[in-house]
């Protein structure tokens, strides 16, 4: 058997670090057998069999000119093997970050903090950490580790499925190359890394007969679980075209009626989502949707109650506003205490 331990990486390649002493090992001989060393394609003897170093070649303070293929020969001139030297650096701890778009799964991505110049792979795993007792800061022995399955095709990402919202996890990403391994440990809780995807299907419609109104509606992001235990709350921003500043409101559901739009001007609207108990952070903004308030007047006939687009208003009771209702279902919110000024203007 070969006296040379096979480092992780392609066969026949041995590794060293620039500026350090490097030992090359002749693979096809018995340990300690004296050999001669040559550079491939060069007749000059690098190290003879009388060096006292047996089957090894020592290169002091290796640099890039030492990279390449070496040949070792036994005393009788037989080929002991060929070795390719590649120089690089041991792994440095990778940089790791984790994010969650819902409360059941999270993903972690990593980048090398320093390029080693050598073949590199990553080992990814996680443990669940649990607290002992409600008022205790001590942690029980963690459970796991379990592998964090990596994306195919070499994307630097792994995903933990079926995570528990209230648990803490310790992520282990280890960078491995032929010169060693280096580990980054990252403690994450789903609550702190939760950032929903932006709401989808944003639509902005005029409200016929109301020249200062726009109705915006949207849906939950597709990535949010279909039957959620946790709801989302929303933040909506709108502004007239060419106006630099956004106005912000926090709707109670999946719809909002804007009552102070500028008549005749198109308005940009966008919406963002967050866990309704304020875990994590707000999503990025949805793509903007545009709408222009109606230019018409109130129709003479009062339509059926269900036809919300043209429903005229009744003076709302300002002293008893509806409680906020996080809801999966869109619910009409035409009436609002902010409406009274416009109502006077329209109905006068």
């Amino acid at each position: 058997s070969s006296p040379c331990p096979q480092a992780w990486g392609p066969p026949g390649v041995q590794y060293g670090q620039p500026g350090r002493s490097v030992k090359l090992c002749c693979p096809g001989v018995t340990a300690g057998d004296p050999v001669s060393w040559f550079r491939d394609g060069e007749p000059k003897l690098l190290q003879g069999p009388d060096s006292g170093l047996g089957h090894e070649l020592v290169l002091a303070q290796a640099d890039s000119t030492d990279e390449g293929t070496y040949i070792c020969q036994t005393l009788d001139g037989a080929l002991g093997g060929t070795v390719t030297l590649q120089l690089g650096y041991p792994p440095a701890r990778p940089v790791v970050s984790c994010q969650a778009a819902d409360y059941e799964n999270f993903s972690c991505t990593w980048s090398p903090s320093q390029i080693s110049g050598l073949p590199t792979r990553y080992l990814t795993s996680y443990r669940k950490k649990t607290v002992l007792g409600a008022d205790s800061q001590r942690r029980s022995p963690s459970t796991g580790p379990w592998p964090c399955p990596q994306d195919p095709l070499g994307a630097a990402r792994c995903v933990v499925h079926g995570a528990e919202f209230w648990s803490q996890y310790r992520i282990n990403v280890t960078e491995v190359n032929p010169l060693g391994a280096s580990t980054r440990l990252l403690d994450v809780s789903l609550q702190s890394i939760l950032r929903p995807d932006p709401p989808q299907g944003l639509r902005v419609e005029s409200v016929p007969g109301y020249p200062r109104r726009l109705r915006a509606s949207w849906t939950y992001p597709a990535s949010w679980p279909c039957q959620p235990h946790f709801l989302l709350k929303f933040r909506l921003q709108y502004r007239p075209a060419q106006h630099p500043a956004w106005s912000t409101v926090e709707p109670a559901g999946l719809e909002e009626v804007i009552t102070d739009a500028v008549a005749g001007l198109p308005h940009a609207v966008r919406v963002s989502a967050r866990d309704f108990l304020d875990a994590g952070t707000w999503s990025t903004w949805s793509p903007e949707a545009w709408g222009t308030p109606s230019t018409g007047t109130i129709p003479k006939e009062i339509p059926a109650w269900g036809q919300l687009h043209t429903q005229p208003e009744v003076e709302p009771q300002v002293d008893s506003p509806a409680p906020p209702r996080p809801s999966l279902q869109p619910h009409p919110r035409l009436l609002d205490h902010r409406d009274s000024v416009e109502q006077v203007a329209v109905l006068a």
Partner: antibody, heavy 118, light 107 residues
Framework: EVQLLESGGGLVQPGGSLRLSCAAS????????MTWVRQAPGKGLEWVSS????????QYADSVKGRFTISRDNSKNTLYLQMNSLRAEDTAVYYC???????????WGRGTLVTVSS | DIQMTQSPSSLSASVGDRVTITCQAS??????LNWYQQKPGKAPKLLIY???NLQTGVPSRFSGSGSGTDFTFTISSLQPEDIATYYC?????????FGPGTKVDIK
């Protein structure tokens, strides 16, 4: 020999913007994480921001998050710090520093002075 | 963020004296600690990395020790050129932090 040369500092009014550059030479720039560290007059050192070799991960001190952006151009061996909404407390000498790895600063530039004042 | 404290904040010693500075982290940082020297008007210079390793070219009178939360930096025999401010710095997590510094001068 590793060399890091910062530029782009100067006097700017509160609320203004500035872009710092760090020209690197003497090493394979695209292999290393890079960092900005600052030092207010008469004060200690404060880490500002770091970026991995690929640019794919960045990190910021809370004091500059949302206002400063770190970036790099590996083809030009240059590190950048875009500073917006500047405040008086951002007045400092800004140093560019390199790894190895993340958060360990083995080589430093000479620094460039940023003064935020009206 | 991990907080770093250093003591003393300043000290005066005679040439040839042994000088010791301590650094404490608010949580375990393993051995992910560096020590830097900064002279007035100059950039910082790395002296010690990974808590106890002497950077190439740094005189052997400088040394470091410790692990976890408590670390020590020592100048075995203070020289006039050692007048400077010394900083510890952790890099255990992704947001590195520096200690407030210790100013060293000659009596």
């Amino acid at each position: 020999e590793v060399q890091l040369l910062e530029s782009g500092g100067g006097l700017v009014q509160p609320g203004g913007s500035l872009r710092l550059s760090c020209a690197a030479s003497g090493f394979t720039f695209s292999w290393y994480s890079m960092t900005w560290v600052r030092q207010a007059p008469g004060k200690g050192l404060e880490w500002v921001s770091s970026i991995v070799p690929s640019g794919g991960h960045t990190q910021y001190a809370d004091s500059v998050k949302g206002r400063f952006t770190i970036s790099r151009d590996n083809s030009k061996n240059t590190l950048y710090l875009q500073m917006n909404s500047l405040r008086a407390e951002d007045t400092a000498v800004y140093y560019c520093a390199k790894g190895p790895g993340w958060g360990s600063f083995w080589q430093w530039g000479r620094g460039t002075l940023v003064t935020v004042s009206s | 963020d991990i907080q770093m404290t250093q003591s003393p904040s300043s000290l005066s010693a005679s040439v040839g004296d042994r000088v010791t500075i301590t650094c404490q982290a608010s949580q375990d940082i393993n051995n992910y600690l560096n020590w830097y020297q900064q002279k007035p008007g100059k950039a910082p210079k790395l002296l010690i990395y990974d808590a106890s390793n002497l950077q190439t070219g740094v005189p052997s009178r400088f040394s470091g020790s410790g692990s976890g939360t408590d670390f020590t930096f020592t100048i075995s025999s203070l020289q006039p050129e050692d007048i400077a401010t010394y900083y510890c710095q952790q890099y255990d997590n992704l947001s590195p932090t520096f200690g407030p510094g210790t100013k060293v001068d000659i009596k």
